[in-house]
């Protein structure tokens, strides 16, 4: 994300197209309080960060509320008055969508439809991962709206589900971040469970009539 200028590595995360976090790793300045200066218009004076992130007592990043215009951030990381890293970035390329909200499950026999609130911007993928204790790894299904139907489930098995949002790479590029996962929820026979047993429960013997 950031070529090293004077050994400074930067990382940008644009949370939900609302808040931007710029962090830096500067081995040369590891015991120094570098300052962060920014602007959202190319011709304005720089403002200084008012919400620093600290690591081991020293500044390591800045959290900003973005001006939602053209999403260009101009910034300068300084040691006193000396700039050690100056750049501009189109923040959208570093999008991290917010975690899915209002996740709901609608069961119908051997299928479940998982829905949540769509985010206010587009070109996203809503991914549902699920597994039962019988599965060695998570299964996955994704759609471009938060309305994902998974079929072929075994009504007798307990399934764990979680959901996340990803930015489409052909729109946002390769440097975005998936959202955090939603909380895991467990379901069996269309009812919510506290957890799925870690080991598969043996099937109950059928009583002959």
């Amino acid at each position: 994300q950031g070529g090293a200028a004077e050994g400074v590595q930067i990382q940008i995360i644009y949370f939900n197209l609302e808040t931007v976090q710029v962090t830096w790793n500067a081995s040369k300045y590891s015991r120094t309080n570098l300052t962060f200066h920014y602007r959202f218009n190319g011709d304005e004076a720089y403002d200084q960060c008012t919400n620093y992130l600290l690591q081991e007592g020293h500044t390591s990043g800045c959290l900003l509320d973005a001006e939602q215009r053209d999403d260009i951030l101009y910034f300068s990381i300084r040691n006193g008055t000396h700039p050690v890293f100056t750049a501009s970035r189109w923040m959208v390329y570093y999008l991290k969508p917010s975690s899915p909200k209002h996740v709901r499950f609608s069961w119908h026999q051997d299928a479940v439809t998982v829905t949540c609130s769509d985010l206010s911007y587009g070109d996203l993928l809503y991914e549902v991962q699920y597994r039962s204790p019988f599965d060695t790894e998570w299964q996955s299904k994704q759609e471009n709206t938060c309305n994902v139907t998974i079929e072929g489930l075994d009504a007798e098995k307990c399934y764990s589900f979680w959901v996340r949002v990803k930015a489409m790479e052909d729109v946002y590029g390769p440097d975005t971040y998936p959202s955090d996962w939603s909380e895991v929820t467990c379901w069996q026979r269309g009812e919510i469970r506290d957890a799925c047993a870690e080991t598969p429960t043996p099937p109950k013997p059928k009583l002959s009539k």
Epitope: G42, Q68, R69, I72, Y74, W90, Y121, G122, D123, V171
Partner: antibody, heavy 121, light 107 residues
Framework: QVQLKQSGPGLVQPSQSLSITCTVS????????LHWVRQSPGKGLEWLGV???????DYNAAFMSRLRITKDNSKSQVFFKMDSLQADDTAIYYC???????????????WGAGTTVTVSS | DIVMTQSQKFMSTSVGDRVSVTCKAS??????VAWYQKKSGQSPKPLIY???SHCSEVPDRFTGSGSGTDFTLTINNVQSEDLAEYFC?????????FGTGTKLEVR
């Protein structure tokens, strides 16, 4: 692929309003702003205004009092309305989409075909 | 507003020649300049941005240079299809402003 389709009248009476719709496909108005530019005979290209992805607008001060840009994200449409047209507003009106590189440098990569507007009685 | 001046309204050249179109900004715009080609009856087509970066699918005979207030679009090995009007544009400050245009005539 990215396309901007413009629809609007060709002839406008003096003192009347001009309304143009720009319908976009291949990208989302929730990510990109949309700009409006015109070319008047003998006047070159003139930037009129923009509606940003969040819905806020910036206008060229010369047109601020009579220009309004709105949009409907769900229909992928942007609406341009200019009031009180006079003969010197005769021009080709374009909507245009920006492309940004990683460093925040940009240009208008896709333009509508243009709406030719003549102001005359 | 920043004024972008293209002092030459018309330029004449021959196929195979090299031609330079110039643009002067009324104040420092860094490298925040783009160039567009406009053919009659068509929409503008981007050629160069950030003063010297190529827009996608633009032949490399088009090159841009300059920073601050003075900018140049150079067309090497001019082709007949380069008959068009060329505009510079600054995006350093709103309102965005364009140059007055230079019409290229290919003999």
């Amino acid at each position: 692929q990215v396309q901007l389709k413009q629809s609007g009248p060709g002839l406008v009476q003096p003192s009347q309003s001009l309304s143009i719709t720009c319908t976009v496909s291949g990208f989302s108005l929730t990510i990109y702003g949309l700009h409006w530019v015109r070319q008047s005979p003998g006047k070159g290209l003139e930037w009129l205004g923009v509606i940003w992805r969040g819905g806020s607008t910036d206008y060229n001060a010369a047109f601020m009092s009579r220009l309004r840009i709105t949009k409907d994200n769900s229909k992928s449409q942007v609406f341009f309305k200019m009031d009180s047209l006079q003969a010197d507003d005769t021009a080709i009106y374009y909507c245009a989409k920006p492309y940004y590189d990683y460093d925040g440098n940009w240009y208008f990569d896709v333009w509508g075909a243009g709406t030719t507007v003549t102001v005359s009685s | 507003d920043i004024v972008m001046t293209q002092s030459q309204k018309f330029m004449s050249t021959s196929v195979g020649d090299r031609v330079s179109v110039t643009c002067k900004a009324s104040q420092n715009v860094g490298t925040n300049v783009a160039w567009y080609q406009k053919k009659s009856g068509q929409s503008p087509k981007p050629l160069i941005y950030s003063a010297s970066s190529h827009c996608s699918e633009v032949p490399d005979r088009f090159t841009g240079s300059g920073s601050g207030t003075d900018f140049t679009l150079t067309i090497n090995n001019v082709q007949s299809e380069d008959l068009a009007e060329y505009f510079c544009q600054q995006y350093n400050r709103y309102p965005l402003t364009f140059g007055t245009g230079t019409k290229l005539e290919v003999r």
